[in-house]
Amino acid sequence: AITEAREEAKPYPLFPGPFPGSLQTDHTPLLSLPHASGYQPALMFSPTQPGRPHTGNVAIPQVTSVESKPLPPLAFKHTVGHIILSEHKGVKFNCSISVPNIYQDTTISWWKDGKELLGAHHAITQFYPDDEVTAIIASFSITSVQRSDNGSYICKMKINNEEIVSDPIYIEVQGLPHFTKQPESMNVTRNTAFNLTCQAVGPPEPVNIFWVQNSSRVNEQPEKSPSVLTVPGLTEMAVFSCEAHNDKGLTVSKGVQINIKAIPSPPTEVSIRNSTAHSILISWVPGFDGYSPFRNCSIQVKEADPLSNGSVMIFNTSALPHLYQIKQLQALANYSIGVSCMNEIGWSAVSPWILASTTEGAPSVAPLNVTVFLNESSDNVDIRWMKPPTKQQDGELVGYRISHVWQSAGISKELLEEVGQNGSRARISVQVHNATCTVRIAAVTRGGVGPFSDPVKIFIPAHGWVDYAPSSTPAPGNADPVLII
């Protein structure tokens, strides 16, 4: 059975008496080899009580002395087997062995849980020689133990390629429970059960768990760690923590807030970034997400004209990047715009409505009923049309642009005329005889030039050449109807 020492035990003196077989009386070590500082802790365990020989790894030397007596087997003396102490206390333990003087260069190494302890550990080896044997004491001290010091410590000594291993010394560092898993903050659906987990370890074990919800204990009796709390559902935010208890005391986990998912708050600060004739770019600041990520947003657009039928256009978009270009709007129109966003619970209310206007655009249709005829007496071409519908002018009409293309014997010339907005007729001089004149008309607003009407052709019979201004871009020929007068 292993021997066990608790920290309440009175410390032994380091060297209570001479080693068996030792002739030395002053016990002053011949040689002391500190591996690190020689701190003397409050708690020490002496390895020097004489005991039965080590039953573990034993080296039996083959060499005999002058009298030819075989040497006894080499083994570490027994020491305390189990040391229990509290965190941050100091501890010192040691291994001792008597080695015949015929062996040179004996070194003792310390090992913990199968790994050699190297570097700046508080290890000291002391040698006490006499006539036949040298007593070697290897001490190991830890000034302030931590949980990581828990484990099984052994001494190893090499002699003649033989390895001598001591019995293990088990160090058990006890302290308050240590959390290995704590509850995590969560966002949960209202009235829906969910789980929280708490796990803590010693030593000492067992560790018992109490759950606390909003300062009230959930379980009246302790539950063994680990513990899973099934919360039967919440209607409002709650704070949870767990208490871990062992014989050393109590550790309380961090408190975690469990939030109830709700519909988002409405977006704020809807603003106009840019307006064109047929589109408005808006941005918004999302409201509080209700503890659930936004999924998408809906832009609602109403015509602000009191005479409109009040229908609402809805445009759906992703929640990011809080920006949307509303398209297919009428030019020079007023709109009310609101934004609503949704999460897994539902839609927010609509943001405060804002007013926005589209700008003037180029007309969307061409003048209608274009007619062209030749006035031979004045050598002019008369053009007449009807102005496009007001709705489709997309702005205030400032005039018309007339394109007339003259084609004759492979030569093509385009001329452009600007006409004021008041009329719906124009007269252009014949530029070439024995030629085809193709006429197209576009309405013009401050927003730009609208589409040209379908081409109308008229043939001008031979009469003689007339000088004309330099031509503009050639127009492609086409098979549109020709009007001959």
Epitope: Q213, N214, S216, E220, Q221, P222, E223, P232, G233, A238
Partner: antibody, heavy 118, light 106 residues
């Protein structure tokens, strides 16, 4: 299956003592507290307190301190309610119940009628 | 201590007529439990933690509420549902019961 079986009815004289037992079966006794609830004739339920079966520590509601004692014999998975110096107003049905999380009483004994009469 | 007030004290209903029982707490509580008791019997767990049906309880029973106001509803009471119903709070010691609501046949 979980069961709480209480001792039988008692007729006592004022000033006497009574000990009501509540034997648990079908679960690990030390894992759940035992609550005691009183119901006077024609009245509602009144929580008297509970005993921690893990540590043996009792908790008493106001009005149930002094003459009322909760105790345990864990070797036989039994909780006890002892009332000393009985008075007429102690006449009631006494229930034991198993307590789980959130102080919910999920299993109840059948009740023990204690009658105090001279 | 938290005082629980149940209303009405008595509820007279015809079978099938919806029953709504109220339990008000003198201060906010975390959860409310409900128990049913018939004459000469021990209380029977009905609803755990405000809205969770106890084992074997039919779905015509439901619970709701939060803060200081809690409700037990029997959507269409059967003859065996005529009994006394008690609420019990979880939040702070001492655990307290309401005074009870008796549901009787009209």
């Amino acid at each position: 299956q979980v069961q709480l079986v209480q001792s039988g009815s008692e007729l006592k004289k004022p000033g006497a003592s009574v000990k009501v037992s509540c034997k648990a079966s079908g679960y690990t006794f030390a894992n759940y507290g035992v609550h005691w609830v009183r119901q006077a004739p024609g009245q509602g339920l009144e929580w008297m307190g509970w005993i921690n079966t893990y540590q043996g520590e009792p908790t008493y509601a106001q009005g149930f301190t002094g003459r009322f004692v909760f105790s345990l014999d864990t070797s036989v998975s039994t909780a006890y309610l002892q009332i000393s110096s009985l008075k007429a107003e102690d006449t009631a049905v006494y229930y034991c119940a198993r307590g789980v999380r959130y102080a919910y009483m999920d299993y109840w004994g059948q009740g023990t009628l204690v009658t105090v009469s001279s | 201590e938290i005082v629980l007030t149940q209303s009405p004290a008595t509820l007279s209903l015809s079978p099938g007529e919806r029953a709504t029982l109220s339990c008000r707490a003198s201060s906010s509580v975390g959860y409310m439990h409900w128990y049913q008791q018939k004459p000469g019997q021990a209380p029977r767990p009905l609803i755990y933690a405000t809205s969770n049906l106890a084992s074997g309880i039919p779905a015509r029973f439901s619970g709701s509420g939060s803060g200081t106001s809690y409700t037990l509803t029997i959507s269409s009471p059967e003859p065996e549902d005529f009994a006394v119903y008690y609420c019990q709070q979880w939040s702070s010691n001492p655990r307290t019961f309401g005074g009870g609501t008796k549901v009787e046949i009209k």
